[in-house]
């Protein structure tokens, strides 16, 4: 969804947490893949 209405500080916090979790999952997957390929 667009960020228009989601300027509330709790929504901003949740968005940050979601991005962090997503990046951790992606980076974790890449790391596992590198280890597997070695």
């Amino acid at each position: 969804h667009s960020d228009g209405i989601f300027t509330d500080s709790y929504s901003r916090y949740r968005k940050q947490m979601a991005v962090k979790k997503y990046l951790a999952a992606v980076l974790g997957k890449r790391y596992k893949q590198r280890v597997k390929n070695k």
Partner: antibody, heavy 121, light 110 residues
């Protein structure tokens, strides 16, 4: 996984009261938690939220009278002051949904049975 | 302020019939809406989130639709067990707001 509220009782107006929410089967380091209340025969009314970092957000009507805090890895307190008869309600503790990149809206996914607070002179 | 308005406040339905409950947001909340069912003496139960996604274990007789400012909960093939009060809730904001919940709709099954 469960949530249980305790501490509700009959108090006189102006008496402070602390309610406790005890969770089991999950950790407060993983989930945001909320307090919601319901006056007898009325609808649901949001009080506030505490996140995994102990930051808090409140409904506009709270105006500093209520404070949410974590007292351990499994308990969340709701401290209430300046109570009036209007605060008579069942107080629910509820777990907040996970946040996802494409859906970071919040929902109340797991509820306790509630604890009744009666304010009367 | 973001206000959630639910209509009707009460509705009667025959077993096997269909019930429609409406929820209006005072501003655009996209698809950030949930529906809850509450029976007397029990806590609310999450039925639908993200406007149309069924929560785990919830019957497919419950259907959520809408986006933006107008949302609908439809209960088809109404059963006696569906007698309850239903609430909508916006999930777009929680800081210094009035109330994210609608006023509730009581469903009476005849």
């Amino acid at each position: 996984q469960s949530v249980e509220e305790s501490g509700g009782r009959l108090v006189t107006p102006g008496t402070p009261l602390t309610l406790t929410c005890t969770v089991s089967g999950f950790s407060l380091s993983s989930y945001d938690m909320s307090w919601v209340r319901q006056a007898p025969g009325k609808g649901l009314e949001y009080i506030g939220i505490i996140n995994t970092n102990d930051d808090t957000w409140y409904a506009s009507w709270v105006k500093g009278r209520f404070t949410i805090s974590k007292t351990s890895s499994t308990t969340v307190d709701l401290k209430m002051t300046s109570l009036t008869t209007e605060d008579t309600a069942t107080y629910f503790c509820a777990r907040i949904s996970d946040a996802y990149v494409f859906d970071y809206a919040y929902y109340f996914t797991l509820w306790g049975q509630g604890t009744l607070v009666t304010v009367s002179s | 302020a973001l206000v959630m308005t639910q209509t009707p406040s009460s509705v009667s339905a025959a077993v096997g019939g269909t019930v429609t409950i409406n929820c209006l947001a005072s501003q655009n909340i996209y698809n950030s809406l949930a529906w809850y069912q509450q029976k007397p003496g029990q806590p609310p139960k999450l039925l639908i989130y993200r406007a149309s996604t069924l929560a785990s274990g919830v019957s497919s007789r419950f259907k959520g639709s809408g986006s933006g400012t107008q949302f609908t909960l439809t209960i088809s093939g109404v059963e006696c067990a569906d007698a309850a009060t239903y609430y909508c809730q916006q999930g777009a904001g929680a800081d210094n707001i009035g109330n994210p919940f609608g006023g509730g709709t009581e469903v009476v099954v005849k």
